[in-house]
Amino acid sequence: FNISGCSTKKLLWTYSTRSEEEFVLFCDLPEPQKSHFCHRNRLSPKQVPEHLPFMGSNDLSDVQWYQQPSNGDPLEDIRKSYPHIIQDKCTLHFLTPGVNNSGSYICRPKMIKSPYDVACCVKMILEVKPQTNASCEYSASHKQDLLLGSTGSISCPSLSCQSDAQSPAVTWYKNGKLLSVERSNRIVVDEVYDYHQGTYVCDYTQSDTVSSWTVRAVVQVRTIVGDTKLKPDILDPVEDTLEVELGKPLTISCKARFGFERVFNPVIKWYIKDSDLEWEVSVPEAKSIKSTLKDEIIERNIILEKVTQRDLRRKFVCFVQNSIGNTTQSVQLKEKRG
């Protein structure tokens, strides 16, 4: 299709080479197309003006994204050619930063229902650059935490070094929806609830004497509880002896509950004590079996191919640790009488 009629928007993504971050493009169809298309505002036939330029499908997923190759080749369907770019309804998610994401992205409805719809498209010209060293050293992170029940704020990473007074007007989105009240480089939250978690996007306009563009940053916000003040609990094994059959395989599970920590480095391991000797066992990787806002339960198993007489003399010790302290639970194997 002819993209010369598409409305055009220039965006700049300056990414930090020090951290992982994501980026999004919204299918910003011009009004009134956008309101009718992306937000399912179903109009009755009487309300539809004759000249409405676009009467697209109300299904949010009925948007097609393309990339325009710089060499003039035909448009490419994003879903077929770019595995690191994911389409979610009217939004395009870039999972990894890099200058190779620079280019022209076009979105339009899949269903063309009237002659007017042909021009119903947006061309977004995305420029991706590494962050300039002129930016301040302590710019806000693209991953920010809000402490539940307390006051907090979400900062726009590309503007976090500027004072509120000199900051340009900022447009904020949360999970793709416009936050029309917020206009500064920081969103202040009086009391943090779990619904404040989500993907926030901040946009502001930058220009030179010639043209202007939108500088965009994406912030992943999570709501968290305060760091635990407790060392981890071992939930299993509870007993310090375990009846086993000689010659049979055996799996002993160690399950531990770790309280939430912002910087979370849990340790869970098995070691064996035999007389005066003690050694760590290389066992399968630990896995998280339950994760909540407040804590995480992690499991790690020790596997014996077959229980031997020697194993009955040993103690199998599960050791768990967080930044507060450590806990151990030992298990002695006992032959089943039978």
Epitope: K10, E127, P130, T132, S135, D208, V210, W213
Partner: antibody
Framework: SLEESGGDLVKPGASLTLTCKAS?????????MCWVRQAPGKGLEWIAC????????TYYANWAKGRFTISETSSTTVTLQMTNLTAADTATYFC??????????????WGPGTLVTVSS | AAVLTQTPSPVSAAVGGTVTISCQAS????????LAWYQQKPGQPPKLLIY???SLASGVPSRFKGSGSGTQFTLTISEVQCEDAATYYC??????????FGGGTEVVVK
């Protein structure tokens, strides 16, 4: 604004460093900083540019490679080191900012220039 | 090497007339449209008039018009004013981070 300094009268074979100071500008990695010169009564001649993304990446006109070195000494200062100067290097040297993004490339801001004269 | 050839020079025009300056590139500019036009008056640095072949820089009167693609470009000044007397340069940007300026065209207004 951009302001050049360091222009001088030097003898052939000498070296000279020019400095470009930026002030009151929006810093963005879409801009590169460049040097362009103009011999008296002649046209504009591009010398070199440096990315302003902190990477230190540079690009030069073929004739300038080796004798001219562009570098960023701070986030607001760019220098041009010139060695083994000859009379042909006599010119006004302009510092210019170029927008390099969205498939566009143009010099959108220029300094007033600084005069370098090479004569014995 | 990338070479930009400007013709003619000098060119004279009467006030209210039209001036056309041509810029021929020895190879296609980047994206076929990365050509800019600058105006320079004596003792001053150049001033951007046109970028990406045909886009008018802000603050530049609409009587300046750029056109062309690939290797052949034109700057047209219609309804020439006295203040348009200056030297005009084209500048091309090429793949591989190469810049080149044309030799310049002096416009004399009578």
């Amino acid at each position: 604004s951009l302001e050049e300094s360091g222009g001088d009268l030097v003898k052939p074979g000498a070296s000279l460093t020019l400095t470009c100071k930026a002030s009151g500008l929006d810093f963005s990695s879409v801009y590169d900083m460049c040097w362009v010169r103009q011999a008296p009564g002649k046209g504009l001649e591009w010398i070199a540019c440096i990315y302003s993304d902190g990477s230190g990446s540079t690009y030069y006109a073929n004739w300038a490679k080796g004798r001219f070195t562009i570098s960023e000494t701070s986030s607001t200062t760019v220098t041009l080191q010139m060695t083994n100067l000859t009379a042909a290097d006599t010119a006004t040297y302009f510092c210019a900012r170029v927008l390099n993004g969205w498939g566009e490339y143009y010099f959108n801001l220029w300094g007033p220039g600084t005069l370098v004269t090479v004569s014995s | 090497a990338a070479v930009l050839t400007q013709t003619p020079s000098p060119v004279s025009a009467a006030v209210g007339g039209t001036v056309t300056i041509s810029c021929q590139a020895s190879q296609s500019v980047y994206n076929n449209n990365n050509l800019a036009w600058y105006q320079q008056k004596p003792g001053q640095p150049p001033k951007l008039l046109i970028y990406t072949a045909s886009s008018l820089a802000s603050g530049v009167p609409s009587r300046f018009k750029g056109s062309g693609s690939g290797t052949q470009f034109t700057l047209t000044i219609s309804e020439v004013q006295c203040e348009d007397a200056a030297t005009y340069y084209c500048q091309g940007y090429y793949s591989g981070y190469i810049n080149a300026f044309g030799g310049g065209t002096e416009v004399v207004v009578k």
